[in-house]
Amino acid sequence: KFSKQSWGLENEALIVRCPRQGKPSYTVDWYYSQTNKSIPTQERNRVFASGQLLKFLPAAVADSGIYTCIVRSPTFNRTGYANVTIYKKQSDCNVPDYLMYSTVSGSEKNSKIYCPTIDLYNWTAPLEWFKNCQALQGSRYRAHKSFLVIDNVMTEDAGDYTCKFIHNENGANYSVTATRSFTVKDEQGFSLFPVIGAPAQNEIKEVEIGKNANLTCSACFGKGTQFLAAVLWQLNGTKITDFGEPRIQQEEGQNQSFSNGLACLDMVLRIADVKEEDLLLQYDCLALNLHGLRRHTVRLSRKNPIDHHS
């Protein structure tokens, strides 16, 4: 249950997360399981521990083995195991099965291929993508953030896709590649002009000064998996990232849910330590897809504090 397989290629970066989780305040220690020898935390080492992460910069075939992580809370130690295998680079084009990440399926309307494990790394766009070892070229292929989008997907697009990116650690660059299979399936779906379920148009949200507040922007876009649909928040008509108020943040990543077969997305706006000036702002929930954009506006009003126990 608390063991995880990880793999990589020699001379590439490999970062492994401890299969046991904890709080930011918990300390995490890493050990070589066979020798019980502690893994150093100093970054000058090629293999070093950094909290929940074990970093091989770069990896070597000899690093293969089982690693133990112990997440230490004040009163309980949680133990996990990372089974790491580092392979020699293949001289030919074929990617063996043991290097493949989980297969993803796509359709004409949705053809996102996420680059596996990329969230563990410190990388900057753009990603490079390859299919069956050939660099992808042409307007049908678009590298967007951590995924590849293929326009007008056809059955011939099925195959093995490799993403390649650079991990940066203290100014040093390390290459990383990851490969997964992509299959194409037929899907009877449709897309609609976005329908915002929450918040209601011109909604007044009561908040307590000094407390945290959450606003959820939730919209549906049609049936089946959607191609290019998004929800986001704006403050006074400005993107959250451009507004420059660190207390107000959008929740990273959009949650996709299917209610009654509809494809819906939601984005949470988190306001820490609500201040008087926050009541003066206009909060816009935006939902957009290929059909267009819909906007619902929310304003905040002060509510009297209530007992927060019950």
């Epitope: 046991r20 989780q21 904890g22 930011p24 305040s25 004040p74 009163t75």
Partner: antibody, heavy 120, light 111 residues
Framework: QVTLKESGPTLVKPTQTLTLTCTFS??????????VGWIRQPPGKALEWLAH???????QYNPALKSRLTITKDTSKNQVVLTMTNMDPVDTATYYC????????????WGQGTTVTVSS | DIVLTQSPASLAVSPGQRATITCRAS??????????MQWYQQKPGQPPKLLIY???NVESGVPARFSGSGSGTDFTLTINPVEANDTANYYC?????????FGQGTKLEIK
């Protein structure tokens, strides 16, 4: 908004087993770092920690009562259940469940409590 | 078990004055440089309410009149200035070791 509510019998006979349910909202016990604990308070006395359960099903008990206590969770129902066997009149108390949150481990939200009397 | 001893058992303070409650632990409650000591307020018929966590952090929504200090084994809850509605029992609690333990409580009355 985090809320918790305790439910269970108000009167229990000696030697019987007490089953208390904590139903909560505003958080999920499948989220890393979350926990729910039980605390009791005899009339006019101090608080006593009984047990708590974490997001990953790690359970911790008060050693003085461990042989009598069982704590379980039902993540889908947002519930935590505490059972206490072989009840005795000295177990008469208000029983609270509480949320363990924050970067560190402490009770930051409490239920209103449920009063349990042990008497024949 | 870590035993927490509060003093005084009770005290009476006039509005506008300072109230100081101390809590001594039988062993250190430090963990990675942090003191795992909390303070709770409990009014009659109500559940405890978190005031201070990890020794000195004031919980959101708690008035700045409440402050906590200390490290290792000796901790203090200070209420300054005291107001009439501060009448309550106050408990310290450690989460450094199982069993988590509470102090025996301090009863604060307003004159």
């Amino acid at each position: 908004q985090v809320t918790l509510k305790e439910s269970g019998p108000t009167l229990v006979k000696p030697t019987q087993t007490l089953t208390l349910t904590c139903t909560f909202s505003g958080f999920s016990l499948s989220t890393s770092g979350m926990g729910v604990g039980w605390i009791r308070q005899p009339p006019g006395k101090a608080l006593e920690w009984l047990a708590h359960i974490w997001w990953d099903d790690v359970k911790q008990y008060n050693p003085a009562l461990k042989s009598r206590l069982t704590i379980t969770k039902d993540t889908s129902k947002n519930q935590v259940v505490l059972t206490m066997t072989n009840m005795d009149p000295v177990d008469t108390a208000t029983y609270y469940c509480a949320h363990i949150g924050g970067d560190y481990d402490y009770f930051d939200f409490w239920g209103q409590g449920t009063t349990v009397t042990v008497s024949s | 078990d870590i035993v927490l001893t509060q003093s005084p058992a009770s005290l009476a303070v006039s509005p506008g004055q300072r109230a100081t409650i101390t809590c001594r632990a039988s062993e250190s409650v430090e963990y990675s440089g942090t003191s795992l000591m909390q303070w709770y307020q409990q009014k009659p018929g109500q559940p405890p309410k978190l005031l201070i966590y990890v020794a000195s952090n004031v919980e959101s929504g708690v008035p700045a009149r409440f402050s906590g200090s200390g490290s290792g084994t000796d901790f203090t809850l200070t209420i300054n200035p005291v107001e009439a509605n501060d009448t309550a029992n106050y408990y310290c609690q450690q989460s450094r070791k199982v069993p988590w333990t509470f102090g025996q409580g301090t009863k604060l009355e307003i004159k």
